[in-house]
């Protein structure tokens, strides 16, 4: 593999459909600009869930309509994905790219299997 990226094997989303996991990378150098992308792999299809580019020491900024939020600390990125439903259960891969300064390094994790269980609807109270 290229750059080493580690992430937990399994995470269970909470009852509100929120899942959090840490994506950690082993930086070969002193990167100042890092790009983190979350990919969802279902069957053989891979789709981008969200992406953020951040300067080391600064906050991650996802697009306003993104379902992801996150914080960074050193070579760790704490990612939170919101609004998940049971149908979103799948393998979520963390991709890290060291964009600046050169050289460019990239790596992908083995993926975090996120399980989402839709809450049971509340029974009607008489």
């Amino acid at each position: 593999k290229a750059m080493h990226v580690a992430q937990p094997a399994v995470v269970l989303a909470n009852s509100r459909g929120t899942a959090s996991f840490v994506c950690e990378y082993a930086s070969p150098g002193k990167a100042t600009e890092v790009r983190v992308t979350v990919l969802r792999q279902a069957d053989s299809q891979v789709t981008e869930v969200c992406a953020a580019t951040y300067m080391m020491g600064n906050e991650l900024t996802f697009l306003d309509d993104s379902i992801c939020t996150g914080t960074s600390s050193g070579n760790q990125v704490n990612l939170t994905i919101q609004g998940l439903r049971a149908m979103d259960t799948g393998l979520y891969i963390c991709k890290v790219e060291l964009m600046y300064p050169p050289p460019y390094y990239m790596g992908i994790g083995n993926g975090t299997q996120i399980y989402v269980i839709d809450p049971e609807p509340c029974p009607d109270s008489d």
Partner: antibody
Amino acid sequence: EVKLDETGGGLVQPGRPIKLSCVASGFTFSDNWMNWVRQSPEKGLEWVAQIRNKPYNYETYYSDSVKGRFTISRDDSKSSVYLQMNNLRTKDMGIYYCTGGFTYWGQGTLVTVSA
Amino acid sequence: DIQMTQSPPSLSASVGETVTITCGASENIYGGLNWYQRKQGKSPQLLIYGATNLADGMSSRFSGSGSGRQYSLKISRLHPDDVATYYCQNVLNTPYTFGGGTKLEIK
């Protein structure tokens, strides 16, 4: 200014060894995974070997075509990377480039294998 | 090992035209793809890294796109100076395989 200067190429007989050297300047050598890439008319560009840096315990990787015959090494104190090539074959002929990551490239040194 | 298939092997176009070179990987490389330009008698130069990012000092007429297994390099408003051989390369995994190259000529 970034510079990568390869030396050590030349004419060598099949089965004989040769050692290539590359001295780098103008960038942070210790932050780079260093590679050797070769170019031949038959095969175009071909990645040969990589040595990673201290955070990666100087791990080494080789293409199948050179595994067991070539050895890559580095000396961070001299900003240098080396390629020891043993048991050379005619198909090893070509221009050998030293690269920092894959961003910085040297001018190359020509290795000719012939009896 | 990941195989990289580049097409076309050669290409002839007129100054001012737009040309596209494609590169296919034998498996998903997650955007881990570089493009290089090699001019006659010169060393290869990094052109695009991470599938879409333009390397320092390269003309914005070059752009990269693609994901998964399929990638392309577009050269807009072709210049005589663009005559070169272009290579794609997998940078996700070792061995870091290159495509076979595309030789670009001007009509």
